[in-house]
């Protein structure tokens, strides 16, 4: 029997469904158990205009140790504001710096990604190590990449259409799922049905889908049924803020009693059949009907309370309106420029407009120091002697204060300029990993340990090693030790920073030829990067150290020149 219920899109204010899934339009997961580097590649497609992305890397401790080093290659087609979380992960990030802006400086090693087509990017990544995972995502809002999780049967990662990334990758699309609704003709009463249909995916084994249901009704007002239909390998974990009738395939449990599994029913696997099920359960209205790819978390927010369904008029806008102004993101767009005698803050109006923000004022901590409207940007400039600047031995600090129309209290952000003339950078060479006894002598075949220090220390800035090389003169040539913040070769290791945050690395030097140079110059380029703030504040310095080389050893690892 045909059920008369004309499904029409529901406005986002009536119902919205967001979800997290491991299904990707193209992807692959491979195993590379013996690789030194775990390589992951993400191709991200965004609509025009700046987008915001939350990217989290999670490491599972293996045998009590952190996983191997990770290279994440990020290929994007348009501007992205990236919020990266990769705590404690030895991460190297390859990306296009003209398109990707970090909300906070990433605090990880970064490399410029060449402007290659997809196939060449994969080749470029594979040159650095076997690819563990690769995925193509369309307009993601957030991505979770789990490291050391690759369960793939493949030994080589080749992009294939409609792939399930398993536990390796989960992502949340920015555009919520299309929610439709309708009136079930000929049924009296006010009972409403919420129908969620999870489509089969390329799944490798059982799956639990967490379904969060948030209905904005007083508990007594609601008479509802939740119908969850999916492939046989899916079970459900339900987290609802209301009591309602549950009708599912497979098994289900409630978040408050997760260990208590309840057997579900055999349900039809067509929209018509599910509408018929709702009717059979005496629902007069389908408040939400959603079809999704295989997901791990689904969130349904609905404001209908039975019998008052409103569908959107055609044409339908399936993309929800952009979020209202995000103050945190707005503050991250303030660029700080430092000169010998002044600090300048710049806020580009084009970016502000994209965030749907209306700025009513930009000042320093001292409100009498206001920004100038320069047409396409707001510019706030002050001499270091003015506007409440705080001067310390190593830097000048202030606060940017932004008044936004949509916010009752002003937004504040610390801003800093380094006084480079007061900073001193030192290279230290040590003969043991305890970094206790400094030396100026290296012995071929013996490990040497290097630490870079800045004094006085600058807590608001991160000291990073960009590159290091050992110049051994005309006979010995140059040995590259670190390039692009990554160790070069097997005989160089980037070590954990000192407790004060000083970068450290070790290297082992061997010679294959004679004569062996007696001296060399260790040269490192370091960068001070603000922990919060804009990349345009980066400061670079090159530091040198003369080394003596003793006692030849003719077995080999790092070659000359």
């Amino acid at each position: 029997e045909t059920v008369h219920c004309d499904l029409q899109p529901v406005g986002p204010e009536r119902g919205e469904v967001t979800y997290t899934t491991s299904q990707v339009s193209k992807g692959c997961v491979a195993q590379a158990p013996n690789a030194i580097l775990e390589v992951h590649v993400l191709f991200l497609e965004f609509p025009t205009g700046p987008s915001q992305l939350e990217l989290t890397l999670q490491a599972s401790k293996q045998n009590g140790t952190w996983p191997r080093e990770v290279l994440l290659v990020l290929s994007v087609n348009s501007s992205v504001f990236l919020h990266l979380q990769a705590l404690g992960i030895p991460l190297h990030l390859a990306y296009n710096s003209s398109l990707v802006t970090f909300q906070e400086p990433p605090g990880v090693n970064t490399t410029e990604l060449p402007s290659f087509p997809k196939t060449q990017i994969l080749e470029w990544a594979a040159e650095r190590g076997p690819i563990t995972s690769a995925a193509e995502l369309n307009d993601p809002q957030s991505i979770l990449l789990r490291l050391g999780q690759a369960q793939g049967s493949l030994s080589f990662c080749m992009l294939e259409a409609s792939q399930d990334m398993g536990r390796t990758l989960e992502w949340r699309p920015r555009t919520p799922a299309l929610v439709r609704g309708c009136h079930l003709e000929g049924v009296a009463g006010h009972k409403e049905a919420h129908i969620l249909r999870v489509l089969p995916g390329h799944s490798a084994g059982p799956r639990t889908v967490t379904v969060k249901v948030e209905l904005s009704c007083a508990p007594g007002d609601l008479d509802a049924v939740l119908i969850l239909q999916g492939p046989p390998y899916v079970s459900w974990l339900i987290d609802a803020n209301h009591n309602m009738q549950i009708w599912t395939t497979g098994e289900y449990s409630f978040k408050i009693f997760p260990e208590k599994n309840i057997r579900g029913f055999k349900l039809p696997d067509t929209p018509q059949g599910l509408l018929g099920e709702a009717r059979m359960l005496n629902a007069s209205i389908v408040a939400s009907f959603v079809e999704l790819p295989l997901a791990s978390i689904v969130s349904l927010h609905a404001s209908s309370c039975g019998g008052r369904l409103q569908t959107s008029p055609a044409p339908i806008q399936t993309t929800p309106p952009k979020d209202t102004c995000s103050p945190e993101l707005l503050m991250s767009l303030i660029q700080t420029k430092c000169a010998d005698d002044a600090m300048t803050l710049v806020l580009k109006k084009e970016l502000v407009a994209h965030l749907k923000c209306t700025i009513t004022g930009l000042t320093f901590w001292d409100p009498s120091c206001e920004a100038e409207d320069r047409g396409d940007k707001f510019v706030l400039r002050s001499a270091y002697s003015s506007c409440g600047m705080q001067v310390s031995a190593s830097m000048i600090s202030n606060e940017a204060v932004v008044n936004i129309l949509s916010s009752s209290s002003p937004q504040r952000k610390k801003v800093h300029c380094l006084n480079m003339d007061s900073l001193s950078f030192q290279l230290g060479l040590y003969l043991s990993p305890h970094f206790l006894q400094a030396s100026n002598t290296i012995e071929p075949g013996q490990q040497s340990f290097v630490q870079v220090r800045v004094s006085p220390s600058v807590s608001e800035f991160l000291l990073q090693l960009d590159s290091c090389h050992l110049d051994l003169g005309p006979e010995g040539g140059t040995v590259e030790l670190i390039q692009g913040r990554a160790a070069k070769g097997n005989c160089v290791s980037l070590l954990s920073p000192s407790p004060e945050g000083d970068p450290r690395f070790s290297f082992l030097l061997h010679f294959y030829t004679v004569p062996i140079p007696k001296t060399g110059t260790l040269s490192c380029t370091v960068a001070l990067r603000p922990k919060t703030g804009s990349q345009d504040q980066e400061v670079h310095r090159t530091v040198f150290m003369r080394l003596n080389i003793i006692s030849p050893d003719l077995s080999g690892c790092t070659s000359k020149g």
Epitope: A339, A342, A383, S386, M389
Partner: antibody
């Protein structure tokens, strides 16, 4: 509008002292650093001293260090320059200037100090 | 201490372009500001931070800075541009303001 008015100039004998003042109005005086700059007759600009908005830092040109003292009274919107042990080469028009949104963005009209026996 | 060197004088015909240079060791790494001073008047800032103009200053005034030379360029020079021009930097190593010796621009 922003106004800076210097006073206290005049003729003084070498080795003697003089105190210059600069009265500020039309802006939040306590928010801005202030400079003294001088210009000897027919010569170029010569920086003398700077004081931070709150008086926390003061810097002097080598030629006046130890002899001149810059100070400010934010409650009275006044900048001062105490000049001791004056020399003939200190003869100049003395300007006070604001260190603001732009470097030296506002200047006074200057006061002439003549050191002569 | 840091030294800025300017040519004592530059002459240019009306409507032509005047270029006034300011030399200093690695001046390109510093922010350079330019002032105009007409006889009997206090100086006026015409370019700051190498190439920015304060409001009210005509677009004819522009600046550049790299290497060991900063340059103030005045295009389509007018008689009213005749004045002394000074470059200035802040020397961070000594915490001193440094002015150049000044350049007299004569409009022929």
């Amino acid at each position: 509008q922003v106004q800076l008015v210097e006073s206290g100039g005049g003729v003084v004998q070498p080795g003697r002292s003089l105190r210059l003042s600069c009265a500020a109005s039309g802006f939040s005086f306590s928010s801005y650093g202030m400079h003294w700059v001088r210009q000897a007759p027919g010569k170029g600009l010569d920086w003398v001293a700077i004081i931070w908005y709150d008086g926390s830092y003061k810097y002097y040109a080598d030629s006046v260090k130890g002899r001149f003292t810059i100070s400010r009274d934010n409650s009275k919107n006044t900048l001062s320059l105490q000049m001791n042990s004056l020399r003939a080469e200190d003869t100049a028009v003395y300007y006070c200037a604001r260190d603001g949104k732009y470097p030296f963005d506002y200047w006074g009209q200057g006061t002439l100090v003549t050191v002569s026996s | 201490s840091y030294v800025l060197t300017q040519p004592p004088s530059v002459s240019v015909a009306p409507g032509q372009t005047a270029r006034i240079t300011c030399g200093g060791n690695n001046i390109g790494s510093k922010s350079v500001h330019w002032y105009q001073q007409k006889p009997g008047q206090a100086p006026v800032l015409v370019v700051y931070d190498d190439s920015d103009r304060p409001s009210g200053i005509p677009e004819r005034f522009s600046g550049s800075n790299s290497g060991n030379t900063a340059t103030l360029t005045i295009s389509r020079v007018e008689a009213g541009d005749e004045a002394d021009y000074y470059c200035q930097v802040w020397d961070r190593s000594s915490d001193h303001v440094v002015f150049g010796g000044g350049t007299k621009l004569t409009v022929l």
